[in-house]
């Protein structure tokens, strides 16, 4: 299908050539800021809360060209940031905890295998 | 436990308050800038492919201060944007198609019990 | 300051081959439209073809189509033009010129490279 | 595909002479209309885009105007490195097309 969109190219109106490779741009894989849900992101037990109870931080996110391909990051940071822990019931107030959070600094869309192989290395590590 | 936090305040350090502040208002709920796959928006034929296979629009995201909330529009506009609409096989190259996508404008969070509601209501016109 | 310098010309025979490059400097590659615009000896100017370096798409004048290709290196900020079964009547000064990018309808070339002859004789 | 006519093909004129070339498109191009002036052996030179904005770094001298079909491309007074040739462009539709040309010379 990439090569269908390489050769039909006749009479179409520049306007709208201009406004769908925008969305290309706009929709492309690259970190995106998103708000995470820290009780989900780290499997923390039911009576635990925290407040705020998500934090915002990048992730890789977007679309890439082709059903066979995902968007996956290839550099990432630690960001620590640090929130309020309620434990519930109530024994204490709630208690500021740091708390180390994955930021994407950078993405690729990569074939599906690539990102098994990938994932499976970290795992055998 | 929203009086506590306000209350235990008073004896944590500013820059905690500030930074903790600020995460509150980067993750709270908003319309946010998202990528939306245009097949799956709207279930078109296995055969149909678009290019770009998504587009850039608003949709209500972030998080709510409590679990039984949901962050929800209020309100939408309609985008129309042109893509390049290709189906297989190729009787014809890629032609150019305008679909108008949800584009939310303003959101809030709702009890679980609201959006249910409102969704059924929607319905039922 | 923005400049476009093409290379590749030459003279080759009826059904060969040529690639042209276009290397790119002074602006974001990727933040503009590239095109290839030919003019044949004592003639005016033909628009040959378009590549968003961005986003890979490309689009031909249908005097070409299946015989050129563009194409776009973007670690290399640089176009390419390959021509395959070349023809006498592909005889010009090839450029390579930029979108100008303004919010209107239309494109129009801002910056245009020196131009690089290619002959088609045998 | 979308003919541009130009007209004329060439002219004669002398220094501080007000010149017009009109350019007619064979449909609806709405503004997307560029003009070029091209000298012997150089690249053609952006002048005015989308119908009526100046390039910037050109003269005020030049203007351009019009919309739809009919396109008029005016230097208020004519200068000594203005003499070169000059073509129109439209870019409404893909491909983009040029007219063939109007040659501008010292009479």
């Known amino acids: 299908t990439e090569e269908t969109i390489k050769f039909a190219a006749a009479h179409y109106n520049t306007e709208i050539l201009k406004s769908i490779d925008n969305e290309w741009r706009k929709t492309q894989c690259m970190p995106r800021e998103v708000c995470i849900d820290v009780g989900k992101e780290f499997g923390v037990a039911t009576n635990t809360f925290f407040k705020p109870p998500c934090v915002s931080v990048y992730r890789c996110g977007g679309c890439c060209n082709s059903e066979g391909l995902q968007c996956m990051n290839t550099s990432t940071s630690y960001l620590s940031k640090t929130l309020f822990e309620i434990t519930v019931p109530l024994s204490q107030g709630p208690k500021p905890v740091t708390i180390s959070f994955a930021n994407h600094t950078s993405c690729r869309c990569m074939s599906k295998l690539d990102v098994y192989r990938q994932v499976h290395s970290i795992i055998r590590r | 436990t929203e009086e506590t936090i306000k209350f235990a305040a008073a004896h944590y350090n500013t820059e905690i308050l500030k930074s903790i502040d600020n995460e509150w208002r980067k993750t709270q709920c908003m319309p946010r800038e998202v990528c939306i796959d245009v097949g799956k928006e709207f279930g078109v034929a296995t055969n149909t492919f678009f290019k770009p296979p998504c587009v850039s629009v608003y949709r209500c995201g972030g998080c709510c201060n409590s679990e039984g909330l949901q962050c929800m529009n209020t309100s939408t506009s309609y985008l129309s944007k042109t893509l390049f609409e290709i189906t297989v096989p190729l009787s014809q190259g890629p032609k150019p198609v305008t679909i108008s996508f949800a584009n939310h404008t303003s959101c809030r969070c709702m009890s679980k019990l609201d959006v249910y509601r409102q969704v059924h209501s929607i319905i039922r016109r | 300051e923005v400049q476009l310098v093409e290379s590749g010309g030459g003279l080759v025979q009826p059904g060969g081959s040529l690639r042209l490059s276009c290397a790119a400097s002074?602006?974001?590659?990727?933040?503009?439209?590239i095109h290839w615009v030919r003019q044949a000896p004592g003639k005016g100017l033909e628009w040959v073809g378009v590549i968003s370096p961005y986003s890979g798409a490309t689009y031909y004048a249908d005097s070409v189509k299946g015989r050129f290709t563009i194409s776009a290196d973007t670690s290399k900020n640089t176009a390419y033009l390959q021509m395959n079964s070349l023809r006498a009547e592909d005889t010009a000064v090839y450029y390579c010129?930029?979108?100008?990018?303004?919010?209107?309808?239309?494109?129009?070339?801002?910056?245009w490279g020196q131009g690089t002859l290619v002959t088609v004789s045998s | 595909d979308i003919q541009m006519t130009q007209s004329p093909s060439s002219l004669s004129a002398s220094v501080g002479d007000r010149v017009t070339i009109t350019c007619r498109a064979s449909q609806d191009v709405s503004t997307a209309v560029a003009w070029y002036q091209q000298k012997p052996g150089k690249a053609p030179k952006l002048l005015i885009y989308s119908a009526s904005f100046l390039y910037s770094g050109v003269p005020s001298r030049f203007s351009g105007s019009g919309s739809g079909t009919d396109f008029t491309l005016t230097i208020s007074s004519l200068q000594p490195e203005d003499f070169a040739t000059y073509y129109c462009q439209q870019s409404y539709t893909t491909p983009p097309t040029f007219g063939q040309g109007t040659k501008v010379e010292i009479k």
């Open positions: 002074g602006f974001t590659f990727t933040d503009n439209w």
């Open positions: 010129a930029r979108d100008a990018d303004y919010d209107y309808a239309g494109w129009a070339f801002d910056y």
